[in-house]
Protein backbone atom coordinates (compact mmCIF):
# COMPACT_ATOMS: atom_id res chain seq x y z
CA UNK A 1 0.00 0.00 0.00
CA UNK A 2 1.24 3.46 -0.85
CA UNK A 3 1.57 5.94 1.98
CA UNK A 4 -0.16 9.29 1.64
CA UNK A 5 1.64 11.82 -0.54
CA UNK A 6 1.16 15.58 -0.39
CA UNK A 7 1.39 17.00 -3.89
CA UNK A 8 2.07 20.67 -4.55
CA UNK A 9 2.28 20.75 -8.34
CA UNK A 10 3.44 24.36 -8.70
CA UNK A 11 7.03 25.12 -7.77
CA UNK A 12 6.26 28.82 -8.05
CA UNK A 13 3.31 31.14 -8.51
CA UNK A 14 3.47 34.82 -9.41
CA UNK A 15 0.57 37.12 -8.55
CA UNK A 16 -0.07 40.83 -8.95
CA UNK A 17 -0.64 42.78 -5.75
CA UNK A 18 -4.34 43.11 -4.97
CA UNK A 19 -5.23 39.88 -6.74
CA UNK A 20 -5.88 36.45 -5.22
CA UNK A 21 -3.26 33.71 -5.17
CA UNK A 22 -4.30 30.09 -5.67
CA UNK A 23 -1.95 27.57 -4.07
CA UNK A 24 -2.60 24.01 -5.18
CA UNK A 25 -2.35 20.97 -2.94
CA UNK A 26 -3.77 17.47 -3.21
CA UNK A 27 -3.31 14.38 -1.10
CA UNK A 28 -3.37 10.84 -2.43
CA UNK A 29 -5.18 9.27 0.48
CA UNK A 30 -7.70 9.96 3.23
CA UNK A 31 -5.48 8.06 5.63
CA UNK A 32 -4.52 9.09 8.26
CA UNK A 33 -7.35 11.14 9.70
CA UNK A 34 -6.24 14.63 10.51
CA UNK A 35 -6.19 18.16 9.19
CA UNK A 36 -4.30 19.85 6.43
CA UNK A 37 -2.47 22.99 7.46
CA UNK A 38 -0.81 25.59 5.27
CA UNK A 39 2.32 27.40 6.42
CA UNK A 40 4.48 30.17 5.03
CA UNK A 41 8.10 29.31 5.55
CA UNK A 42 9.63 26.29 7.25
CA UNK A 43 11.07 25.52 10.64
CA UNK A 44 9.94 26.67 14.07
CA UNK A 45 9.22 30.23 12.96
CA UNK A 46 6.85 29.20 10.17
CA UNK A 47 3.61 31.15 9.96
CA UNK A 48 0.25 29.37 10.01
CA UNK A 49 -1.83 30.46 7.03
CA UNK A 50 -4.74 27.99 7.25
CA UNK A 51 -5.81 25.11 9.46
CA UNK A 52 -8.56 22.83 8.19
CA UNK A 53 -9.45 21.85 11.74
CA UNK A 54 -9.85 25.18 13.50
CA UNK A 55 -9.22 28.89 13.49
CA UNK A 56 -10.42 31.93 11.59
CA UNK A 57 -8.55 32.83 8.41
CA UNK A 58 -10.49 35.68 6.79
CA UNK A 59 -8.29 35.98 3.70
CA UNK A 60 -8.18 32.25 2.98
CA UNK A 61 -10.82 30.19 1.23
CA UNK A 62 -10.61 26.57 0.17
CA UNK A 63 -10.87 26.09 -3.57
CA UNK A 64 -12.89 22.90 -3.26
CA UNK A 65 -15.40 21.97 -0.58
CA UNK A 66 -13.11 20.81 2.18
CA UNK A 67 -15.98 19.16 4.08
CA UNK A 68 -16.96 17.05 1.06
CA UNK A 69 -16.74 13.39 1.97
CA UNK A 70 -14.01 12.26 -0.44
CA UNK A 71 -12.23 15.59 -0.83
CA UNK A 72 -8.51 15.25 -1.42
CA UNK A 73 -7.99 18.73 -2.81
CA UNK A 74 -6.75 21.18 -0.21
CA UNK A 75 -5.86 24.03 -2.53
CA UNK A 76 -6.41 27.46 -1.05
CA UNK A 77 -7.00 30.95 -2.36
CA UNK A 78 -5.49 33.90 -0.50
CA UNK A 79 -7.22 37.17 -1.27
CA UNK A 80 -5.86 40.70 -1.60
CA UNK A 81 -2.23 39.71 -1.97
CA UNK A 82 0.40 42.25 -0.90
CA UNK A 83 4.20 42.10 -1.24
CA UNK A 84 4.34 41.05 2.42
CA UNK A 85 2.72 37.73 1.42
CA UNK A 86 5.71 36.65 -0.68
CA UNK A 87 7.42 33.47 0.45
CA UNK A 88 7.33 29.68 0.20
CA UNK A 89 4.05 28.04 1.18
CA UNK A 90 3.87 24.47 2.43
CA UNK A 91 0.81 22.23 2.50
CA UNK A 92 1.23 19.90 5.48
CA UNK A 93 -0.82 16.85 6.44
CA UNK A 94 -1.25 16.28 10.17
CA UNK A 95 -2.31 13.12 11.94
CA UNK A 96 -5.12 13.36 14.45
CA UNK A 97 -3.88 13.23 18.01
CA UNK A 98 -3.38 15.17 21.18
CA UNK A 99 -1.69 17.22 19.87
CA UNK A 100 -1.96 16.62 16.14
CA UNK A 101 1.38 15.52 14.74
CA UNK A 102 2.92 16.47 11.42
CA UNK A 103 2.67 13.52 9.06
CA UNK A 104 3.88 14.73 5.67
CA UNK A 105 4.66 18.00 3.95
CA UNK A 106 4.43 19.06 0.35
CA UNK A 107 7.52 20.32 -1.46
CA UNK A 108 6.39 23.93 -1.20
CA UNK A 109 5.22 26.61 -3.62
CA UNK A 110 7.09 29.89 -3.85
CA UNK A 111 4.75 32.85 -4.10
CA UNK A 112 6.20 35.96 -5.68
CA UNK A 113 4.18 39.15 -5.71
CA UNK A 114 4.26 41.55 -8.61
CA UNK A 115 3.69 44.99 -7.11
CA UNK A 116 3.50 48.18 -9.12
CA UNK A 117 5.85 51.01 -8.28
CA UNK A 118 4.23 54.09 -6.81
CA UNK A 119 3.96 57.15 -9.04
CA UNK A 120 7.44 58.66 -9.26
CA UNK A 121 7.82 61.85 -7.23
CA UNK A 122 10.31 64.34 -8.65
CA UNK A 123 11.64 67.09 -6.44
CA UNK A 124 14.03 69.86 -7.28
CA UNK A 125 16.34 72.12 -5.27
CA UNK A 126 14.96 74.06 -2.33
CA UNK A 127 16.19 77.39 -3.73
CA UNK A 128 16.00 78.79 -7.24
CA UNK A 129 19.11 78.88 -9.38
CA UNK A 130 20.14 80.99 -12.33
CA UNK A 131 21.07 79.92 -15.86
CA UNK A 132 24.44 78.20 -16.36
CA UNK A 133 24.16 76.68 -12.90
CA UNK A 134 23.82 72.92 -12.39
CA UNK A 135 20.90 71.78 -10.22
CA UNK A 136 19.98 68.38 -8.87
CA UNK A 137 16.61 66.66 -9.17
CA UNK A 138 15.61 63.56 -7.25
CA UNK A 139 13.08 60.92 -8.25
CA UNK A 140 11.62 58.35 -5.86
CA UNK A 141 9.28 55.41 -6.34
CA UNK A 142 8.39 52.76 -3.80
CA UNK A 143 6.70 49.44 -3.13
CA UNK A 144 7.52 47.52 -6.29
CA UNK A 145 8.40 43.88 -6.78
CA UNK A 146 10.26 42.16 -8.36
CA UNK A 147 13.45 44.22 -7.97
CA UNK A 148 14.22 44.72 -11.67
CA UNK A 149 13.26 48.24 -12.73
CA UNK A 150 14.38 50.81 -15.30
CA UNK A 151 14.56 54.55 -14.63
CA UNK A 152 15.24 57.24 -17.25
CA UNK A 153 15.50 61.02 -17.07
CA UNK A 154 14.38 63.44 -19.75
CA UNK A 155 14.50 67.19 -20.23
CA UNK A 156 11.96 68.36 -22.80
CA UNK A 157 11.97 64.91 -24.40
CA UNK A 158 15.75 64.64 -24.54
CA UNK A 159 17.21 61.81 -22.49
CA UNK A 160 19.66 62.86 -19.79
CA UNK A 161 22.78 60.90 -19.00
CA UNK A 162 24.13 62.55 -15.86
CA UNK A 163 22.29 60.70 -13.10
CA UNK A 164 22.83 58.12 -10.37
CA UNK A 165 20.26 55.51 -9.33
CA UNK A 166 19.96 53.18 -6.34
CA UNK A 167 17.46 50.37 -5.69
CA UNK A 168 17.00 49.44 -2.04
CA UNK A 169 17.35 47.16 -0.26
CA UNK A 170 20.21 45.34 -1.94
CA UNK A 171 19.16 41.91 -0.59
CA UNK A 172 15.92 39.96 -0.74
CA UNK A 173 12.84 41.91 0.29
CA UNK A 174 9.09 41.83 -0.11
CA UNK A 175 9.23 45.15 -1.96
CA UNK A 176 11.77 47.67 -3.18
CA UNK A 177 12.33 51.40 -3.60
CA UNK A 178 14.25 53.35 -6.23
CA UNK A 179 16.02 56.67 -5.72
CA UNK A 180 17.70 58.60 -8.50
CA UNK A 181 19.48 61.97 -8.68
CA UNK A 182 19.96 63.78 -11.98
CA UNK A 183 22.05 66.86 -12.69
CA UNK A 184 20.60 69.50 -15.02
CA UNK A 185 22.33 72.61 -16.40
CA UNK A 186 19.88 75.53 -16.56
CA UNK A 187 19.59 77.86 -19.54
CA UNK A 188 17.74 81.16 -19.93
CA UNK A 189 15.16 79.35 -22.06
CA UNK A 190 14.17 76.82 -19.36
CA UNK A 191 11.13 78.58 -17.89
CA UNK A 192 8.84 76.33 -19.93
CA UNK A 193 11.10 73.27 -19.60
CA UNK A 194 10.16 70.06 -17.81
CA UNK A 195 12.30 67.41 -16.22
CA UNK A 196 10.70 63.97 -16.43
CA UNK A 197 11.56 60.82 -14.47
CA UNK A 198 10.25 57.70 -16.20
CA UNK A 199 9.97 54.33 -14.46
CA UNK A 200 9.42 51.06 -16.36
CA UNK A 201 8.53 47.83 -14.54
CA UNK A 202 7.15 44.40 -15.46
CA UNK A 203 3.86 45.22 -13.72
CA UNK A 204 3.22 48.25 -15.92
CA UNK A 205 2.75 46.30 -19.17
CA UNK A 206 4.95 48.62 -21.20
CA UNK A 207 3.22 51.77 -20.01
CA UNK A 208 5.82 53.50 -17.82
CA UNK A 209 5.01 55.80 -14.95
CA UNK A 210 6.20 59.38 -15.13
CA UNK A 211 6.92 62.06 -12.60
CA UNK A 212 7.56 65.62 -13.69
CA UNK A 213 9.09 68.78 -12.35
CA UNK A 214 8.61 72.15 -14.02
CA UNK A 215 11.81 74.13 -14.21
CA UNK A 216 9.67 77.24 -13.71
CA UNK A 217 9.76 76.29 -10.03
CA UNK A 218 13.54 76.02 -10.06
CA UNK A 219 14.90 78.70 -12.36
CA UNK A 220 15.46 82.39 -11.76
CA UNK A 221 16.28 84.52 -14.79
CA UNK A 222 17.61 87.90 -13.63
CA UNK A 223 16.46 90.93 -15.55
CA UNK A 224 18.43 93.19 -17.87
CA UNK A 225 17.86 96.91 -17.37
CA UNK A 226 17.91 99.76 -19.85
CA UNK A 227 17.20 103.39 -18.91
CA UNK A 228 16.42 105.83 -21.73
CA UNK A 229 15.40 109.44 -21.92
CA UNK A 230 12.38 110.18 -24.07
CA UNK A 231 11.87 113.40 -26.01
CA UNK A 232 10.61 116.31 -23.90
CA UNK A 233 6.85 116.19 -23.56
CA UNK A 234 6.42 119.61 -21.99
CA UNK A 235 8.78 122.49 -21.69
CA UNK A 236 9.88 121.62 -18.16
CA UNK A 237 9.31 117.80 -18.12
CA UNK A 238 11.46 114.90 -19.21
CA UNK A 239 10.15 111.29 -19.50
CA UNK A 240 12.69 108.69 -18.44
CA UNK A 241 11.88 104.97 -18.93
CA UNK A 242 13.39 101.87 -17.38
CA UNK A 243 12.99 98.76 -19.50
CA UNK A 244 13.16 95.60 -17.36
CA UNK A 245 13.59 92.64 -19.72
CA UNK A 246 13.68 88.84 -19.69
CA UNK A 247 13.11 88.16 -16.01
CA UNK A 248 11.48 85.24 -14.20
CA UNK A 249 9.65 84.82 -11.87
CA UNK A 250 7.43 87.87 -11.94
CA UNK A 251 8.17 88.98 -8.37
CA UNK A 252 9.92 92.28 -8.89
CA UNK A 253 10.09 95.70 -7.20
CA UNK A 254 11.45 98.82 -8.87
CA UNK A 255 12.64 102.00 -7.18
CA UNK A 256 13.45 105.30 -8.88
CA UNK A 257 16.15 107.41 -7.28
CA UNK A 258 16.86 111.06 -8.12
CA UNK A 259 20.40 111.93 -7.09
CA UNK A 260 20.26 109.02 -4.67
CA UNK A 261 16.95 109.97 -3.12
CA UNK A 262 14.00 107.66 -3.48
CA UNK A 263 11.48 109.15 -5.80
CA UNK A 264 9.02 106.28 -6.31
CA UNK A 265 8.72 102.54 -5.62
CA UNK A 266 6.43 100.21 -7.51
CA UNK A 267 5.79 96.50 -7.96
CA UNK A 268 5.65 94.86 -11.38
CA UNK A 269 2.05 94.24 -12.26
CA UNK A 270 1.02 94.56 -15.89
CA UNK A 271 3.93 92.63 -17.35
CA UNK A 272 4.19 91.22 -20.86
CA UNK A 273 5.22 87.61 -21.36
CA UNK A 274 7.82 86.51 -23.85
CA UNK A 275 7.64 83.29 -25.84
CA UNK A 276 10.25 81.71 -23.62
CA UNK A 277 8.15 82.38 -20.51
CA UNK A 278 10.20 85.30 -19.21
CA UNK A 279 8.62 88.69 -18.57
CA UNK A 280 9.21 92.28 -19.68
CA UNK A 281 8.12 95.35 -17.85
CA UNK A 282 8.56 99.06 -18.29
CA UNK A 283 8.46 101.86 -15.74
CA UNK A 284 8.67 105.56 -16.51
CA UNK A 285 9.40 108.65 -14.50
CA UNK A 286 8.44 112.26 -15.31
CA UNK A 287 11.16 114.58 -14.12
CA UNK A 288 10.39 118.25 -13.59
CA UNK A 289 13.59 119.84 -14.91
CA UNK A 290 12.76 123.31 -13.62
CA UNK A 291 12.97 122.01 -10.09
CA UNK A 292 16.67 121.17 -10.59
CA UNK A 293 19.51 123.67 -10.95
CA UNK A 294 22.17 120.99 -11.58
CA UNK A 295 22.35 117.81 -13.60
CA UNK A 296 20.21 114.97 -12.24
CA UNK A 297 21.39 111.37 -11.78
CA UNK A 298 18.39 109.08 -12.28
CA UNK A 299 18.75 105.52 -11.10
CA UNK A 300 16.41 102.60 -11.83
CA UNK A 301 16.94 100.08 -9.05
CA UNK A 302 15.36 96.63 -9.31
CA UNK A 303 15.01 93.99 -6.63
CA UNK A 304 14.06 90.70 -8.31
CA UNK A 305 12.73 87.69 -6.43
CA UNK A 306 14.30 88.75 -3.15
CA UNK A 307 17.82 88.96 -4.63
CA UNK A 308 20.21 91.88 -4.10
CA UNK A 309 19.15 94.91 -6.11
CA UNK A 310 20.59 95.65 -9.54
CA UNK A 311 20.50 99.16 -10.96
CA UNK A 312 21.05 101.24 -14.03
CA UNK A 313 21.61 105.03 -13.99
CA UNK A 314 21.07 107.86 -16.44
CA UNK A 315 22.44 111.37 -16.21
CA UNK A 316 19.92 114.02 -17.05
CA UNK A 317 21.52 117.26 -18.25
CA UNK A 318 19.91 120.42 -16.99
CA UNK A 319 20.80 123.38 -19.24
CA UNK A 320 21.08 126.78 -17.65
Amino acid sequence: EEELQVIQPDKSVSVAAGESAILHCTVTSLIPVGPIQWFRGAGPARELIYNQKEGHFPRVTTVSESTKRENMDFSISISNITPADAGTYYCVKFRKGSPDTEFKSGAGTELSVRAKPSAPVVSGPAARATPQHTVSFTCESHGFSPRDITLKWFKNGNELSDFQTNVDPVGESVSYSIHSTAKVVLTREDVHSQVICEVAHVTLQGDPLRGTANLSETIRVPPTLEVTQQPVRAENQVNVTCQVRKFYPQRLQLTWLENGNVSRTETASTVTENKDGTYNWMSWLLVNVSAHRDDVKLTCQVEHDGQPAVSKSHDLKVSA
Partner: antibody, heavy 115, light 111 residues
Protein backbone atom coordinates in the same frame (compact mmCIF):
# COMPACT_ATOMS: atom_id res chain seq x y z
CA UNK B 1 -20.01 0.79 -4.39
CA UNK B 2 -20.45 -1.72 -1.64
CA UNK B 3 -18.84 -3.69 1.15
CA UNK B 4 -19.60 -7.37 1.76
CA UNK B 5 -18.60 -9.10 4.99
CA UNK B 6 -18.01 -12.77 5.46
CA UNK B 7 -16.41 -15.11 7.97
CA UNK B 8 -18.92 -14.90 10.80
CA UNK B 9 -20.33 -17.94 12.56
CA UNK B 10 -20.28 -19.93 15.74
CA UNK B 11 -17.03 -20.07 17.66
CA UNK B 12 -16.17 -21.49 21.06
CA UNK B 13 -15.00 -19.25 23.90
CA UNK B 14 -11.23 -18.73 23.66
CA UNK B 15 -11.36 -19.41 19.94
CA UNK B 16 -10.35 -17.22 17.00
CA UNK B 17 -12.10 -15.98 13.89
CA UNK B 18 -11.12 -13.91 10.87
CA UNK B 19 -13.73 -11.69 9.27
CA UNK B 20 -13.38 -10.42 5.70
CA UNK B 21 -14.75 -7.25 4.14
CA UNK B 22 -14.62 -7.17 0.35
CA UNK B 23 -14.93 -3.81 -1.43
CA UNK B 24 -16.34 -3.38 -4.90
CA UNK B 25 -16.62 -0.15 -6.86
CA UNK B 26 -13.72 1.55 -5.08
CA UNK B 27 -10.20 0.83 -3.88
CA UNK B 28 -9.35 0.57 -0.22
CA UNK B 29 -5.85 1.98 -0.88
CA UNK B 30 -6.83 5.57 -0.13
CA UNK B 31 -9.55 4.80 2.42
CA UNK B 32 -9.60 3.57 5.95
CA UNK B 33 -11.85 0.67 6.89
CA UNK B 34 -13.39 0.74 10.33
CA UNK B 35 -15.00 -2.10 12.21
CA UNK B 36 -18.11 -1.64 14.35
CA UNK B 37 -20.08 -4.25 16.23
CA UNK B 38 -23.57 -4.49 17.69
CA UNK B 39 -24.52 -6.98 20.38
CA UNK B 40 -28.08 -8.34 20.08
CA UNK B 41 -30.56 -5.65 21.11
CA UNK B 42 -27.76 -3.22 22.00
CA UNK B 43 -26.15 -0.13 20.49
CA UNK B 44 -23.22 0.32 18.16
CA UNK B 45 -19.65 -0.08 19.40
CA UNK B 46 -16.51 1.10 17.58
CA UNK B 47 -13.71 -1.47 17.39
CA UNK B 48 -10.96 0.10 15.33
CA UNK B 49 -9.71 1.37 11.99
CA UNK B 50 -7.32 -0.12 9.48
CA UNK B 51 -5.48 2.47 7.45
CA UNK B 52 -2.06 1.64 6.05
CA UNK B 53 0.56 -0.50 7.76
CA UNK B 54 1.54 2.06 10.36
CA UNK B 55 -1.89 3.61 10.65
CA UNK B 56 -4.05 1.07 12.41
CA UNK B 57 -5.69 1.78 15.72
CA UNK B 58 -8.22 0.24 18.07
CA UNK B 59 -10.52 1.23 20.88
CA UNK B 60 -8.77 0.73 24.20
CA UNK B 61 -10.93 -2.27 25.07
CA UNK B 62 -10.12 -3.98 21.76
CA UNK B 63 -6.33 -3.67 21.83
CA UNK B 64 -4.53 -6.98 21.91
CA UNK B 65 -7.40 -9.27 20.91
CA UNK B 66 -8.40 -7.59 17.63
CA UNK B 67 -6.05 -7.04 14.71
CA UNK B 68 -6.88 -5.55 11.34
CA UNK B 69 -5.23 -5.62 7.95
CA UNK B 70 -6.20 -4.88 4.38
CA UNK B 71 -5.30 -5.11 0.74
CA UNK B 72 -6.54 -2.78 -2.00
CA UNK B 73 -9.79 -4.74 -2.21
CA UNK B 74 -10.33 -6.59 1.08
CA UNK B 75 -10.07 -5.74 4.75
CA UNK B 76 -9.72 -8.29 7.53
CA UNK B 77 -10.42 -8.39 11.25
CA UNK B 78 -8.62 -11.11 13.19
CA UNK B 79 -10.28 -11.82 16.55
CA UNK B 80 -8.64 -13.95 19.24
CA UNK B 81 -9.49 -15.11 22.77
CA UNK B 82 -13.16 -14.67 22.00
CA UNK B 83 -15.64 -14.44 24.85
CA UNK B 84 -19.41 -14.73 25.10
CA UNK B 85 -19.71 -10.95 25.33
CA UNK B 86 -18.10 -10.67 21.88
CA UNK B 87 -21.28 -12.12 20.39
CA UNK B 88 -22.51 -9.46 17.98
CA UNK B 89 -23.14 -8.48 14.39
CA UNK B 90 -19.85 -7.18 13.03
CA UNK B 91 -19.91 -4.41 10.43
CA UNK B 92 -17.16 -3.03 8.30
CA UNK B 93 -17.52 0.56 7.10
CA UNK B 94 -15.51 2.77 4.80
CA UNK B 95 -13.97 5.72 6.65
CA UNK B 96 -11.76 6.70 9.54
CA UNK B 97 -14.00 9.30 11.28
CA UNK B 98 -13.84 13.11 11.60
CA UNK B 99 -13.88 14.40 7.99
CA UNK B 100 -13.77 10.82 6.71
CA UNK B 101 -17.03 9.44 8.16
CA UNK B 102 -18.39 5.90 7.82
CA UNK B 103 -20.38 6.32 4.61
CA UNK B 104 -20.54 2.79 3.15
CA UNK B 105 -21.37 -0.14 5.41
CA UNK B 106 -21.37 -3.84 4.90
CA UNK B 107 -24.53 -5.82 5.63
CA UNK B 108 -22.94 -7.22 8.79
CA UNK B 109 -21.89 -10.71 9.75
CA UNK B 110 -23.04 -12.44 12.96
CA UNK B 111 -20.42 -13.86 15.29
CA UNK B 112 -21.71 -16.09 18.05
CA UNK B 113 -19.35 -17.10 20.84
CA UNK B 114 -20.80 -20.07 22.68
CA UNK B 115 -19.84 -23.50 23.86
CA UNK C 1 -11.78 8.25 26.65
CA UNK C 2 -14.63 10.38 25.45
CA UNK C 3 -18.17 9.40 26.44
CA UNK C 4 -21.27 10.19 24.40
CA UNK C 5 -24.69 10.51 26.02
CA UNK C 6 -27.85 10.63 23.92
CA UNK C 7 -31.22 11.81 25.12
CA UNK C 8 -33.94 10.89 25.22
CA UNK C 9 -33.44 7.14 24.81
CA UNK C 10 -36.72 7.02 22.95
CA UNK C 11 -39.25 9.49 21.61
CA UNK C 12 -42.79 9.01 20.33
CA UNK C 13 -43.82 11.28 17.50
CA UNK C 14 -46.26 11.58 14.63
CA UNK C 15 -45.71 12.06 10.92
CA UNK C 16 -45.11 15.76 10.26
CA UNK C 17 -43.74 16.45 13.72
CA UNK C 18 -40.48 18.32 14.29
CA UNK C 19 -38.16 16.06 16.26
CA UNK C 20 -34.96 17.11 18.02
CA UNK C 21 -32.44 14.60 19.34
CA UNK C 22 -29.50 15.57 21.49
CA UNK C 23 -26.02 14.18 21.99
CA UNK C 24 -23.65 15.34 24.70
CA UNK C 25 -19.90 14.61 24.86
CA UNK C 26 -18.00 14.27 28.14
CA UNK C 27 -15.33 16.57 26.68
CA UNK C 28 -15.02 18.68 23.55
CA UNK C 29 -14.89 16.52 20.46
CA UNK C 30 -11.90 16.78 18.12
CA UNK C 31 -11.86 20.08 16.29
CA UNK C 32 -15.15 20.89 18.07
CA UNK C 33 -16.94 19.18 15.16
CA UNK C 34 -15.98 15.48 15.16
CA UNK C 35 -19.57 14.36 15.48
CA UNK C 36 -21.61 12.25 13.06
CA UNK C 37 -25.22 11.02 13.12
CA UNK C 38 -26.31 7.60 11.85
CA UNK C 39 -29.76 6.12 11.27
CA UNK C 40 -30.37 2.41 11.76
CA UNK C 41 -33.48 0.43 10.99
CA UNK C 42 -34.04 -3.09 12.35
CA UNK C 43 -32.01 -5.74 10.53
CA UNK C 44 -30.10 -3.14 8.51
CA UNK C 45 -26.67 -1.58 8.67
CA UNK C 46 -26.41 2.01 9.91
CA UNK C 47 -26.68 4.83 7.38
CA UNK C 48 -24.68 8.08 7.53
CA UNK C 49 -26.84 11.21 7.85
CA UNK C 50 -24.63 14.04 9.12
CA UNK C 51 -20.89 14.43 9.63
CA UNK C 52 -18.63 17.23 10.89
CA UNK C 53 -21.57 18.12 13.16
CA UNK C 54 -23.60 19.85 10.44
CA UNK C 55 -22.62 18.59 6.97
CA UNK C 56 -25.42 16.68 5.28
CA UNK C 57 -24.23 13.41 3.72
CA UNK C 58 -24.85 12.78 0.03
CA UNK C 59 -28.40 11.70 -0.77
CA UNK C 60 -29.80 12.51 2.67
CA UNK C 61 -33.08 14.51 2.60
CA UNK C 62 -32.80 18.15 3.64
CA UNK C 63 -35.32 17.67 6.46
CA UNK C 64 -32.37 16.31 8.45
CA UNK C 65 -30.02 18.90 9.93
CA UNK C 66 -27.26 18.86 12.49
CA UNK C 67 -25.95 21.60 14.73
CA UNK C 68 -23.74 22.14 17.73
CA UNK C 69 -20.10 22.49 18.62
CA UNK C 70 -17.74 21.34 21.35
CA UNK C 71 -19.81 19.13 23.64
CA UNK C 72 -23.47 19.69 22.74
CA UNK C 73 -25.02 18.59 19.48
CA UNK C 74 -28.50 18.16 18.06
CA UNK C 75 -30.07 16.31 15.17
CA UNK C 76 -33.30 17.85 13.95
CA UNK C 77 -35.89 16.23 11.68
CA UNK C 78 -38.00 19.17 10.53
CA UNK C 79 -41.03 17.13 9.41
CA UNK C 80 -41.03 13.48 10.38
CA UNK C 81 -41.80 11.05 7.55
CA UNK C 82 -42.94 7.42 7.88
CA UNK C 83 -39.51 6.15 6.76
CA UNK C 84 -37.79 8.11 9.54
CA UNK C 85 -38.97 5.82 12.34
CA UNK C 86 -35.65 4.23 13.35
CA UNK C 87 -32.87 4.39 15.93
CA UNK C 88 -30.43 7.29 15.68
CA UNK C 89 -26.84 7.12 16.91
CA UNK C 90 -24.26 9.86 17.33
CA UNK C 91 -20.57 9.05 16.94
CA UNK C 92 -18.11 11.40 18.62
CA UNK C 93 -14.37 11.50 18.25
CA UNK C 94 -11.92 12.56 20.93
CA UNK C 95 -8.41 13.89 20.36
CA UNK C 96 -6.94 10.42 19.95
CA UNK C 97 -7.32 8.60 16.61
CA UNK C 98 -8.89 5.56 18.21
CA UNK C 99 -11.13 7.51 20.55
CA UNK C 100 -14.36 7.11 18.58
CA UNK C 101 -17.43 6.37 20.67
CA UNK C 102 -21.11 5.90 19.79
CA UNK C 103 -23.88 7.28 21.94
CA UNK C 104 -26.44 4.84 23.33
CA UNK C 105 -28.97 5.69 20.61
CA UNK C 106 -32.40 7.31 20.49
CA UNK C 107 -35.32 5.31 19.16
CA UNK C 108 -37.93 7.36 17.28
CA UNK C 109 -41.26 5.50 17.53
CA UNK C 110 -44.73 6.08 16.12
CA UNK C 111 -47.04 7.79 18.56
Amino acid sequence: RQLVESGGGLVQPGGSLRLSCAASGFSLSSHGISWVRQAPGKGLEYIGTIGTGVITYYASWAKGRFTGSKTSSTAYLQMTSLRAEDTAVYYCARGSAWNDPFDYWGQGTLVTVSS
Amino acid sequence: DIEMTQSPSSVSASVGDRVTLTCQASQSVYGNNDLAWYQQKPGQAPKLLIYLASTLATGVPSRFSGSGSGTDFTLTISSLQPEDFATYYCLGGGDDEADNVFGGGTKVEIK
